[in-house]
Interface confidence: low
């Protein structure tokens, strides 16, 4: 209504402070200057605005920055970030890791939203590759982040970034993703000694070829069954009974419990019964 468009006398906001929570939506629209809001964005998060009031503040910023917000504003969006659409975020140019961290903090504990996915995409594309600091940050907030990337996107991850990856970050990776990550991990950890190397490479072994598994079997690594079960079937099939026994060490007894599951099932069927009998586990080829 026409009479609501003008700011009532004495209500013009001189700064962003708690008094604004008592303003109706139309009063916020009429009495808060967008440029003032932009320069004092860091104060917004300390004020318990309703979601409706935040909508008004977002609208004011949208009008002030139709081509997309500057990073100085983005860094201080706080909870207002939750109001942004992927379309809004696609207009942004986020270059600072601190800005990324600030916005991820707002979404902390939540699953990755389309807004966050768009933000990360914009940030990574702007950097040109997924560097170690970025990967460190992203996997800290979203342990499943790495596995949400396509094999093509993963190919841009430099080997140096692999040091940031924790075992749980690979929980949901499929074999195609591990095929890309494993060679990078092998390169990243190549200067480590045997036992340390195995600890680091273990999570990536779902992408390992047969020859690497054969090499590991000569190093007394004692691979656990959970890791063995994630190996590529085509990589496991050529292994001999002796090689699997050396690879698993004391964990070899676990083969019995997994004899009906891949890759154990398929591997058993490839072996001579005489060789299987040497394990003493009652495995039937």
């Amino acid at each position: 209504e026409v009479e609501k468009t003008a700011c009532p006398s004495g209500k013009k906001a001189r700064e962003i402070d708690e008094s604004l929570i008592f303003y109706k939506k139309w009063e916020l629209e009429a009495c808060v200057d967008a440029a003032l809001l932009a320069t004092q964005m860091d104060r917004v998060n300390a004020i318990p605005f309703t979601y409706e009031q935040l909508d008004v503040l977002k609208h004011k910023l949208d009008e002030l920055y139709p081509q997309g917000y500057p990073e100085s504003v983005i860094q201080h969006l706080g909870y207002l970030f939750l109001k942004m659409s992927p379309e809004d975020i696609r207009k942004w140019n986020v270059t600072s890791l601190e800005t990324l961290k600030a916005l991820l903090e707002v979404n902390k504990g939540h699953e990755m939203s389309p807004q966050v996915a768009t933000l990360i995409d914009r940030f990574v594309k702007g950097r040109g590759q997924l560097d170690k600091d970025t990967l460190d940050t992203l996997t800290a907030f979203y342990p499943g982040y790495l596995c949400s990337l396509s094999p093509e996107e993963l190919s841009s991850v430099p080997p140096s970034s692999i040091w940031a990856v924790r075992p749980q970050d690979l929980d949901t990776c499929d074999p195609r993703q591990l095929d890309v990550l494993y060679p990078k991990a092998r390169l990243a950890f190549q200067n480590m000694n045997g036992s340390e190397y195995f600890v680091k490479i273990q999570s990536f072994l779902g992408g390992a070829p047969t020859e690497d598994l054969k090499a590991l079997s000569q190093q007394n690594v004692s691979m656990d069954l959970a890791t063995f079960m994630k190996l590529r079937t085509d990589a496991v099939l050529p292994l001999t009974v002796a090689e699997v026994q050396k690879l698993l060490g004391p964990h070899v007894e676990g083969l019995k419990a997994e004899e009906r599951h891949r890759p154990v099932r398929d591997w058993i069927l490839r072996q001579r019964q005489d060789d299987l009998d040497t394990l003493g586990l009652g495995l039937q080829g």
Partner: antibody, heavy 119, light 107 residues
Framework: EVQLLESGGGLVQPGGSLRLSCAAS????????MTWVRQAPGKGLEWVSG????????YYADAVKGRFTISRDNSKNTLYLQMNSLRAEDTAVYYC????????????WGQGTLVTVSS | DIQMTQSPSSLSASVGDRVTITCRSS??????LAWYQQKPEKAPQSLIY???SLQSGVPSRFSGSGSGTDFTLTISNLQPEDFATYYC?????????FGGGTKVEIK
């Protein structure tokens, strides 16, 4: 056929502890995130806790944080819920459920086990 | 936390009726919504995930729609075995939260 079988429920005094188990069969257990959901008598469903495939990531509802611990043993195809410092308001049927097509949605549920906290 | 509000809390209907249950979230959740059916003394069963995707083995008379904050579960040709309580659940963010339930009773 996927089957989830809960056990370990029963009557316990306030402040006491219980450990629930959920034995899974008919699925590659180590490939799925799992969760516990509870239902107080005559009430609706309430999510309690969730765990990633390796057990490396866990989530809890505020009402149980610090008192309940979710864990899993992939070699035994079993999910656990250790419940300490139990309160009357924890009285409920506890269901374990398997992650569905998306993390957070659940396509298979166990039949539930009743936990009663009373003096 | 995201609040999920279902309506109505109960309804009476006859076999063959078209039944609609709505679920509203306190903030936008995209399409991250599931629907479950629960019969007395039984565990819940998954009907719909991702707001509109039918769970394998669920009859096609069940359908889901919506995104953002407003969602609907529709049963197009109510059958005797459909009399039960229905719950929506958001999985956009932790903690995961359920609606209060809608009990569908025989008229």
């Amino acid at each position: 056929e996927v089957q989830l079988l809960e056990s370990g429920g029963g009557l316990v005094q306030p402040g006491g502890s219980l450990r629930l188990s959920c034995a899974a069969s008919g699925l590659t257990f180590r490939s799925y995130a799992m969760t516990w959901v509870r239902q107080a008598p005559g009430k609706g469903l309430e999510w309690v806790s969730g765990i990633s495939v390796s057990g490396g990531i866990t989530y809890y509802a505020d009402a149980v944080k610090g008192r309940f611990t979710i864990s899993r043993d992939n070699s035994k195809n079993t999910l656990y819920l250790q419940m300490n410092s139990l309160r009357a308001e924890d009285t409920a049927v506890y269901y374990c459920a398997k992650r569905g097509a998306a993390v957070g949605s659940f396509d298979y549920w166990g039949q539930g086990t009743l936990v009663t906290v009373s003096s | 936390d995201i609040q999920m509000t279902q309506s109505p809390s109960s309804l009476s209907a006859s076999v063959g009726d078209r039944v609609t249950i709505t679920c509203r979230s306190s903030q936008g959740i995209g399409s991250w919504l599931a629907w479950y059916q629960q019969k007395p003394e039984k565990a819940p069963q998954s009907l719909i995930y991702a707001a509109s995707s039918l769970q394998s083995g669920v009859p096609s008379r069940f359908s889901g729609s919506g995104s953002g904050t407003d969602f609907t579960l529709t049963i197009s040709n109510l059958q005797p075995e459909d009399f039960a309580t229905y719950y929506c659940q958001q999985y956009n963010s932790y903690p995961l939260t359920f609606g209060g339930g809608t009990k569908v009773e025989i008229k």
